[in-house]
């Protein structure tokens, strides 16, 4: 169940998709990834206030228990709900190869 | 890819399964759940230091970018990798029913 998309903390403060530009050096990939030379990394960043984009029943429980025991139980966390595939051209022992990664770029976010 | 399970922060400090005892009142379920009267909620709690239980490539990227831009990119977060089903006896309009929830109790944790 995908709960409320209204952010009570103000526009853009809650869990949503962000794009971060990163070089191969930034990612520690300079040795094995040849292309792209720069990656537009889409990731999930932002707060998860009560019931905002709750991914499932577990997220709802976590919200309730965090309210009761904030020092013990953390608030739900903003993580990818799905991913976009990305093709990397990577170095192999003898040359280069194209490899598709299905779990690299976040496509959609939720709180869990 | 499931990365290192050694916690550099000390025993029990990194992302792992915890059990939190919760009453129906704690969970806000007193009105619609009849049984169990108390739930041993298993949830994922703990820090996600570099490459600890990295769920996938996205988590590895997040670790690298968090190291570079800690104010912009958060560290990976400890969330369920899988769930255990749980049966709740719940109140309906006309009586009670048994309902299995597949996304309520964390079974295993990883960092993402």
């Amino acid at each position: 169940a995908r709960n409320g998309d209204h952010c009570p903390l103000g526009p853009g403060r809650c869990c949503r998709l962000h794009t971060v530009r990163a070089s191969l050096e930034d990612l520690g990939w300079a040795d094995w990834v040849l292309s792209p030379r720069e990656v537009q990394v889409t990731m999930c960043i932002g707060a998860c206030p009560s019931q905002f984009r709750a991914a499932n029943m577990h997220a709802q429980i976590k919200t309730s228990l965090h309210r009761l025991k904030p020092d013990t139980v953390p608030a739900p966390c903003c993580v990818p709900a799905s991913y976009n595939p990305m093709v990397l051209i990577q170095k192999t022992d003898t040359g280069v190869s194209l490899q598709t990664y299905d779990d690299l770029l976040a496509k959609d976010c939720h709180c869990i | 890819a499931r990365n290192g399970d050694h916690c550099p922060l000390g025993p029990g400090r990194c992302c792992r399964l915890h059990t939190v005892r919760a009453s129906l009142e704690d969970l806000g379920w007193a009105d619609w759940v009849l049984s169990p009267r108390e739930v041993q909620v298993t949830m994922c709690i703990g820090a996600c230091p570099s490459q600890f239980r990295a769920a996938n490539m996205h988590a590895q990227i997040k670790t690298s970018l968090h190291r570079l831009k800690p104010d912009t990119v958060p560290a990976p977060c400890c969330v369920p990798a899988s769930y255990n089903p749980m049966v709740l006896i719940q109140k309906t309009d006309t009586g009670v029913s048994l309902q299995t929830y597949d996304d309520l109790l964390a079974k295993d944790c990883h960092c993402i």
Epitope: W32, I89, V96 | -
Partner: antibody
């Protein structure tokens, strides 16, 4: 930003020779580096290249005749057992996939008995 | 081994005119565009002109233009200057490291 090869010299056939490439203005640990050679009056031959961390790769004709290695400050090319056919100007250059964008002036190695 | 065939030398050009050099490969380069063009003058190291088949390297005049993909590539020099007299090389990166290399070179003579 620049690269420079060590002085070339006259060597006798079979005597191993190591050329050293030094970079200025950029970090070798962030870049792929290549070695290319050119025999007098001939075209360019790509010998091989080395990754940012120092792993070397070679083109087919090399066949064990050369070894490329890398330290934090230099890239070395060892001619394991030179023959007269290895007489050439040897160039160190920065790059691999997106072209070789910075070249050294080159150094002449003469193999003669 | 890969055969990278360039336009035979020498190629004659006139100042202000246009010259075209071709580079044909017996196998496709990586991504269809991992091909570079270099200019070399006597006694000097090569200079990168074009990379990724069509991207102009830093500081290179826009008179130089690269085109093509896969196995067939072209370098076009428009508004030719005396300073363009040089030997031009194409170089390709292939799926197998052992195939990487340069074309034989094309000498451009400017009259």
């Amino acid at each position: 930003q620049s690269v420079k090869e060590s002085e070339g010299r006259l060597v006798t056939p079979g005597t191993p020779l190591t050329l050293t490439c030094t970079a200025s203005g950029f970090s070798l640990s962030s870049h792929w580096m290549s070695w290319v050679r050119q025999a007098p009056g001939k075209g360019l031959e790509w010998i091989g290249f080395v990754s940012p961390s120092g792993r070397a790769y070679y083109t087919s004709w090399v066949n064990g005749r050369f070894t490329i290695s890398k330290t934090s400050t230099t890239v070395d090319l060892k001619i394991t057992s030179p023959t007269t056919e290895d007489t050439a100007t040897y160039f160190c250059a920065r790059g691999y996939t997106s072209g070789l964008d910075i070249w050294g002036p080159g150094t002449l190695v003469t193999v003669s008995s | 081994a890969i055969d990278m065939t360039q336009t035979p030398s020498p190629v004659s050009a006139t100042v202000g005119g246009t010259v075209t050099i071709s580079c044909q490969s017996s196998k496709s380069v990586v991504n269809g565009d991992w091909l570079a063009w270099y200019q070399q003058k006597p006694g000097q190291p090569p200079k990168l002109l074009i990379y990724d088949a069509a991207t102009l390297a830093s500081g290179v005049p826009s008179r130089f233009k690269g085109s093509g993909s896969g196995t067939q590539f072209t370098l076009t020099i428009s508004d030719v200057q005396c300073a363009d007299a040089a030997t031009y090389y194409c170089a390709g990166v292939y799926n197998n490291d052992s195939d990487n290399g340069f074309g034989g070179g094309t000498e451009v003579v400017v009259k």
